[in-house]
């Protein structure tokens, strides 16, 4: 779970050790603040749960790519 250290900054202190299916993912945001101990990705699932993930892991990069493409492709 991400932790809010103040109103403006949310940090991840631990990463999920399970790969999440892209079908369960709704969106993501990047955590790059130098106030945080680690750079991270926070995935939001389709049931609005937020999950911290390690952006160095290939599945995380692939999931970000998938979501980016989904956002850019107009729905029929």
């Amino acid at each position: 779970q991400p932790d809010a250290i103040n109103a403006a900054v949310t940090c991840c202190y631990n990463f999920t050790n399970r790969k999440i299916s892209v079908q369960r993912l709704a969106s993501y945001r990047r955590i790059t603040s130098s106030k945080c101990p680690k750079e991270a990705v926070i995935f939001k699932t389709i049931v609005a749960k937020e999950i911290c993930a390690d952006p160095k892991q290939k599945w995380v990069q692939d999931s970000m790519d998938h979501l980016d493409k989904q956002i850019q492709t107009p729905k029929p």
Epitope: R30, T32, P55
Partner: antibody, heavy 117, light 107 residues
Framework: QVQLVQSGAEVKKPGSSVKVSCKAS????????MHWVRQAPGQGLEWMGR????????KFDPKFQGRVTITADTSTSTAYMELSSLRSEDTAVYYC??????????WGQGTTVTVSS | DIQMTQSPSSLSASVGDRVTITCKAF??????RAWYQQKPGKAPKLLIH???SLEHGVPSRFSGSGSGTDYTLTISSLQPEDFATYYC?????????FGGGTKVEIK
């Protein structure tokens, strides 16, 4: 506060090698990627490659593949870039930068490398 | 490599002007682009990354827009400290590539 401090200016002969260091403070380098970007005099920015200090995996622009070596020492929070077979076109300011997403949030102050006979 | 074409290469403007710099990628980069500001003798400074993420401490007069292959950096009201060179960069796929830069000069 994140700081990246690079080694000093170098003057090198064509055909030789140069090794530039980048010491990080205010962050654990194993939690990010360390990149190297160069800028020739009056020119634009050129990404050379990066390292994951956690596992020493590297990725390079094919243009530099075989001529550049990027290493990192997590015990001293220092990244290194070595460029071999130097030619005059390698005269540039070399920057280290950090970021896992492919953009660069913090930069070193730059190291000027001059290649001249 | 994904080529990034930036225009104009230079422009002259006055304090208070609205300034627009454009960047065209040779393929879709899905909003994975960043904008940097560089002053002479200094390292580049990150301004914007991704769709519209303004870097912490960057004034709100800077904004980014665009999608697909076409992206824009806008400075809504140019300030004296904004005279510099600006670069776009794509981080959709390695090797990460930069535009050629836009030098913003005082008119």
């Amino acid at each position: 506060q994140v700081q990246l401090v690079q080694s000093g200016a170098e003057v090198k002969k064509p055909g030789s090698s140069v090794k530039v260091s980048c010491k990080a403070s205010g962050l654990t380098i194993s939690h990010t990627y360390m990149h190297w970007v160069r800028q020739a005099p009056g020119q634009g920015l050129e990404w050379m490659g990066r390292i994951d200090p956690d596992n020493h995996n590297t990725k390079f622009d094919p243009k530099f593949q075989g001529r550049v070596t990027i290493t990192a020492d997590t015990s001293t929070s220092t990244a290194y870039m070595e460029l071999s077979s130097l030619r005059s076109e390698d005269t540039a300011v070399y920057y280290c930068a950090r970021g896992v997403f492919g953009f660069f949030e913090h930069w070193g102050q730059g190291t000027t490398v001059t290649v001249s006979s | 490599d994904i080529q990034m074409t930036q225009s104009p290469s230079s422009l002259s403007a006055s304090v208070g002007d609205r300034v627009t710099i454009t960047c065209k990628a040779f393929e879709d980069i899905y909003n994975r682009r960043a904008w940097y500001q560089q002053k002479p003798g200094k390292a580049p400074k990150l301004l914007i990354h991704g769709a519209t993420s303004l870097e912490h401490g960057v004034p709100s007069r800077f904004s980014g827009s665009g999608s697909g292959t076409d992206y824009t950096l806008t400075i809504s009201s140019l300030q004296p400290e904004d005279f510099a060179t600006y670069y776009c960069q794509q981080f959709w796929s390695a090797p990460y590539t930069f535009g050629g830069g836009t030098k913003v000069e005082i008119k």
